[in-house]
Interface confidence: low
């Protein structure tokens, strides 16, 4: 004869566990039904009656089979620096991710708790490592023969143009300026265009502050972002 199927609630055999989507209630000492995602336990089971489940109220959810007495509250609305990538429903929490130009400085189980603007490398510094969803931009000083004249979270250091005759030598934050009409190479996009001809490689002067190339300090709630590292700007 096939084994009789036990209906919840039932006392489990000694040493055995409750079945899938059931839980052992310590008080009743019975295996009882879990509530499905989108529901919660309104009344816990007894020896003679099974769990009574109820739908989650608005702005609350349960994602798993459960026996929690209250549904979880959905996270607060996404802030202005975030995008809602998953809406709050009875079965899932709202997920907020950082909008473009920002990264997640403090993550939570799903989505981001605190977004921060990507560091912008100031003139004389270029992007050594671009920002990602979870890491900040790393800036580095422009090496001799290269420059960056922008405050940007994406611009790298670019080579100086090569002049026949140098009017003004280039440095870390400025391209070389040539004296006559055309340089020997086409200029990098975004370089300041002054018509001039070509000369020797321009002299390069390093920027005085030596920046940290480490990512910015981790952000801790409830404080705001830590000051940006040298070679970067906060906005």
């Amino acid at each position: 004869l096939p084994a009789q199927v036990a209906f919840t609630p039932y006392a489990p055999e000694p040493g055995s566990t409750c079945r899938l989507r059931e839980y052992y209630d310590q008080t009743a000492q019975m295996c009882c039904s879990k509530c499905s995602p989108g529901q919660h336990a309104k009344v816990f089971c007894t020896k003679t009656s099974d769990t009574v489940c109820d739908s989650c109220e608005d702005s609350t959810y349960t994602q798993l089979w459960n026996w929690v007495p209250e549904c979880l509250s959905c996270g607060s609305r996404c802030s202005s620096d975030q995008v809602e990538t998953q809406a709050c429903t009875r079965e899932q929490n709202r997920i907020c991710t950082c909008r473009p130009g920002w990264y997640c400085a403090l993550s939570k189980q799903e989505g981001c708790r605190l977004c921060a603007p990507l560091r912008k490398c100031r003139p004389g510094f270029g992007v050594a490592r671009p920002g990602t969803e979870t890491s900040d931009v790393v800036c580095k000083p422009c090496a001799p023969g290269t420059f960056s004249n922008t405050t940007s979270s994406t611009d790298i250091c670019r080579p100086h143009q090569i002049c026949n005759v140098v009017a003004i030598p280039g440095n870390a934050s400025m391209d070389a300026v040539c004296t006559s009409t055309s340089p020997t190479r086409s200029m990098a996009p975004g370089a300041v265009h002054l018509p001039q001809p070509v000369s020797t490689r321009s002299q390069h002067t390093q920027p005085t502050p030596e920046p940290s190339t480490a990512p910015s300090t981790s952000f801790l709630l409830p404080m705001g972002p830590s000051p940006p590292a040298e070679g970067s700007t906060g906005d």
């Epitope: 209630d25 310590q26 816990f44 929690v68 007495p69 209250e70 996270g75």
Partner: antibody, heavy 124, light 110 residues
């Protein structure tokens, strides 16, 4: 400033009653899960119970019969009603809140905000 | 009742030592375990929640691990300000709870 402040402690005779208050400022109690925790002199922490953001109360086994947790949203205040007090109820009583109000209603993610505590002495 | 058993209950250590405290739970609580530090006359301070997540402003020398029934708090290099009492706390089970906290571990200077 986000804070919790307990009040209402003091000397009470055995068998007497006392109601402690926990006033919240800087956030709304109605959207928070807040616990009452006590600590007898020289002893460890003891969880009394909690009230969830939906208003459901939870109690430890020993507290169910004599302690009641309630909340007045209009005053942004949490209460602990203690009846039939005994000498062993002498302790510092704390209220404590989950670090974020959007999670399980009973300290699943710890209690990140605590009041300074109020001392209750039960003695004749 | 669900029981949280901390060990050791007392620990004598020196500055710079690596310290490990364990918390054993009588039934599975997934990862819903927190750790607190308490100094005499002060309210407890949350160190770690969800077993391994460092609370705001807590130094990185503190770390937590474990899930189910076995959990550990580790202080990688004990500092003078770390001498205190440490408690674990479960936040998963609400029915039939004796105490949500462990009995505590007092860390004293050797």
């Amino acid at each position: 400033e986000v804070q919790l402040v307990e009040s209402g402690g003091g000397l009470v005779q055995p068998g007497g009653s006392l109601r402690l208050s926990c006033a919240a400022s800087g956030f709304s109690l109605s959207s928070s899960a807040v616990s009452w925790v006590r600590q007898a002199p020289g002893k460890g922490l003891e969880w009394i119970g909690a009230i969830g953001s939906g208003g459901t109360s939870y109690y430890s086994n020993w507290a169910k019969s004599r302690f009641t947790i309630s909340r007045d949203n209009s005053k942004n205040t949490l209460y602990l009603q203690m009846n039939s007090l005994r000498a062993e109820d002498t302790a510092v009583y704390y209220c404590a809140r989950d670090p974020n109000s959007s999670d399980y209603p009973y300290g699943a993610y710890g209690m990140g905000l605590w009041g300074p505590g109020t001392l209750v002495t039960v003695s004749s | 009742d669900i029981q949280l058993t901390q060990s050791p209950s007392f620990l004598s250590a020196s500055v710079g030592d690596r310290v490990t405290i364990t918390c054993q739970v009588s039934q599975s609580i997934s990862s819903y375990l927190s750790w607190y530090q308490q100094k005499p006359g002060k309210a407890p301070k949350l160190l770690i929640y969800y077993a391994s997540t460092l609370a705001s402003g807590v130094p990185s020398r503190f770390s937590g691990s474990g899930s189910g029934t076995e959990f550990t708090l580790t202080i990688s290099s004990l500092q003078p300000e770390d001498f205190a009492t440490y408690y674990c706390q479960q936040g998963y089970i609400t029915s039939n709870v004796g105490n949500a906290f462990g009995g505590g571990t007092k860390v004293e200077i050797k």
